[in-house]
């Protein structure tokens, strides 16, 4: 496909498009992870995810079903992304006794410390509550060593789930997640519906929440959630996540219930002008002359920094790799070394607008 050509100034220098010689026209370049539905896509709607909703592309390039968090005792920890499964964890007030890949096979309620004992470590999604004697002296509850053991997860008659606290304030909206990943409320301190395919957590005490109408029987607690591709901002409003649909960007972290999607420059490019949650301007990764020394960093970061040659020498960097290989993308801090005079203005091509969102993020909301 022509969109696999190296990144270059085609179609009036618009990186979101490429020129297809076969059809003799400018075509929209589908973002990474999306496939065109026709030979020469004209708009984002002509691009589709590689996998169906609720499937992700695994290491073997197969579309694999994301795990579901639809069991009543599970909540979604991280959403199903194009290249990674959804991850579930035990809902607040419960811990995992039998783990499973990207999920938990068995959740139990956190134990309540018996009389004479206090919480040493509160329960988490992974661990049960750990109790300790209330005072240095041995309390009646600890008369026998048996009573001082951490209760076994299966036999805790006094265990109680974390109480559900009602939302009190009244904001203008309180959307639920919809679309291909409609979800039931499964927030911290909230219960969730058994029938929901996935869940996205919301704190029950978020500012700007208003109680909804009661839910149908068995559907759990309805509280503020946002539609897909929206997150709950600091003011308690559902706000659009930035999109990474510019061809030179890839998704770094997905759009989550309380944070925007973040984008970074695609491999082979570095960020010349950074922006909140994204990069306003990516430039081709430079190939530097012999006198520029490459200094490897921690491989986990997959970053490379460039050390300037001794004073008096001039590094000679080509704008594009000559061998066609693209190193991993780099952080904005490195890019300043490469392009310290990077323009702070953002060109806005007419066919693929880029704008700064209300949080200063560049948004190319092209779908």
């Amino acid at each position: 496909f022509p969109q696999d050509r190296p990144f270059e100034d085609t179609c009036h220098g618009n990186p979101s498009h490429y020129y297809d010689k076969a059809v003799r026209r400018c075509c929209y370049r589908c973002p990474m992870g999306l496939f065109p539905t026709q030979q020469c896509p004209q708009r984002p709607t002509d691009c589709r995810k590689q996998c169906e909703p609720d499937y992700y592309l695994d290491e073997a390039d197969r579309c694999t079903a994301c795990v579901t968090c639809s069991r009543d005792d599970l909540v979604e920890k991280t959403p199903c992304a194009w290249n990674s499964s959804r991850v579930c964890e035990c809902r607040p007030g419960m811990f995992c006794s039998t783990s499973a890949v990207n999920s938990c096979a068995r959740c139990f309620f956190h134990s309540v410390c018996p009389a004479g004992m206090i919480v040493k470590f509160p329960g988490t999604a992974q661990k049960n509550t750990v109790c300790e004697p209330a005072s240095p002296g041995v309390s009646p509850a600890c008369a026998s060593p048996e009573n001082c053991k951490e209760p076994s997860s299966g036999t805790i008659p006094q265990a109680k789930p974390t109480p559900v606290s009602p939302a009190t304030s009244s904001a203008s909206t309180m959307p639920v997640r919809g679309g291909t990943r409609l979800a039931q409320e499964a927030a911290s301190k909230l219960t969730r519906a058994p029938d929901s395919p996935s869940s996205v957590g919301r704190p029950s005490s978020d500012p700007g929440l208003s109680p909804t109408q009661p839910c149908p029987e068995g559907s759990g607690d309805c509280r503020k959630q946002c539609e897909p591709d929206y997150y709950l901002d600091e003011a308690g409003r559902c706000t659009a996540c930035v999109s990474c649909s510019r061809d030179d960007l890839v998704e770094k972290t997905p759009c989550a219930w309380n944070s925007s999607r973040t984008c970074e420059c695609r491999p082979g490019m570095i960020c010349a002008t950074s922006a909140t949650n994204s990069c306003a301007r990516c430039v081709p990764y430079p190939i530097c002359a012999a006198e520029t020394v490459t200094k490897p960093q921690d491989m986990a970061e997959k970053d490379t920094t460039f050390e300037a040659p001794p004073l008096g020498t001039q590094p000679d960097c080509n704008p594009t790799p000559e061998n066609g290989e693209a190193p991993a993308s780099t952080s904005p801090t490195q890019s300043l070394l490469v392009d310290s005079q990077a323009s702070k203005t953002l060109p806005i091509p007419t066919s693929a607008p880029v704008a700064l969102s209300s949080t200063g993020k560049p948004v190319l909301d092209a779908g």
Epitope: P44, T173, T180, A193, R237, P353, S358, D365, A366
Partner: antibody
Framework: QVQLVQSGSELKKPGASVKVSCKAS????????IHWVRRPPGKDLEWIGY????????DYNQNFQGRVTITADKSTSTAYMELSSLRSEDTAVYYC????????????????WGQGTTVTVSS | IELTQSPSFLSASVGDRVTVTCKAS??????VAWFQQKPGKAPKVLIY???YRESGVPDRFTGSGSGTDFTLTISSLQPEDFAEYFC?????????FGGGTKVEIK
Amino acid sequence: QVQLVQSGSELKKPGASVKVSCKASGYTFTTYTIHWVRRPPGKDLEWIGYINPSSGCSDYNQNFQGRVTITADKSTSTAYMELSSLRSEDTAVYYCARRADYGNYEYTWFAYWGQGTTVTVSS
Amino acid sequence: IELTQSPSFLSASVGDRVTVTCKASQNVGTNVAWFQQKPGKAPKVLIYSASYRESGVPDRFTGSGSGTDFTLTISSLQPEDFAEYFCQQYHTYPLTFGGGTKVEIK
């Protein structure tokens, strides 16, 4: 193809309630939220709220909070919008709408609309 | 977020170039859609993400803008284009709409 078919016109007295239906077809009903929007004569379109048919959870614009109830019946793929304590300013064309399904992102602009239901509130 | 659309009314002739503007009270990125509505009909989406034409929409309709200022342009008005046009922001809930622009025959 996606279709949203709404119930017929309603004439109501002030203080009464009205329940408008929206039957969806051409897609899996539980996959998308159904939104309700109204347009009073000579005024702007106004977003009322929406329902998640999968969970039954609904959300409303603060302007309607307490007076509106949006529900959904999965068995018939129908969403309902009930507005109570009607007043003359509730006279409007009420629309149900569904967001688009396009590519990787799921922002809420409406590609599919019902034909509209005229609700007249008059004594 | 308030959307202020202008003009409210516009008289034009077939073949005219028509421009409608929509100003948001705060930054909405490019999260704006434009709709056309004819009397007795449901709105029809023309443009989404500020500048992308919906499939099947004639290329005489173009959208532009970002941040707070958006424009819908009809390059050469056709008889079927006489209708009302309005913008919608979907950046932040509650979703809001512009007041509409009625394009009438001169």
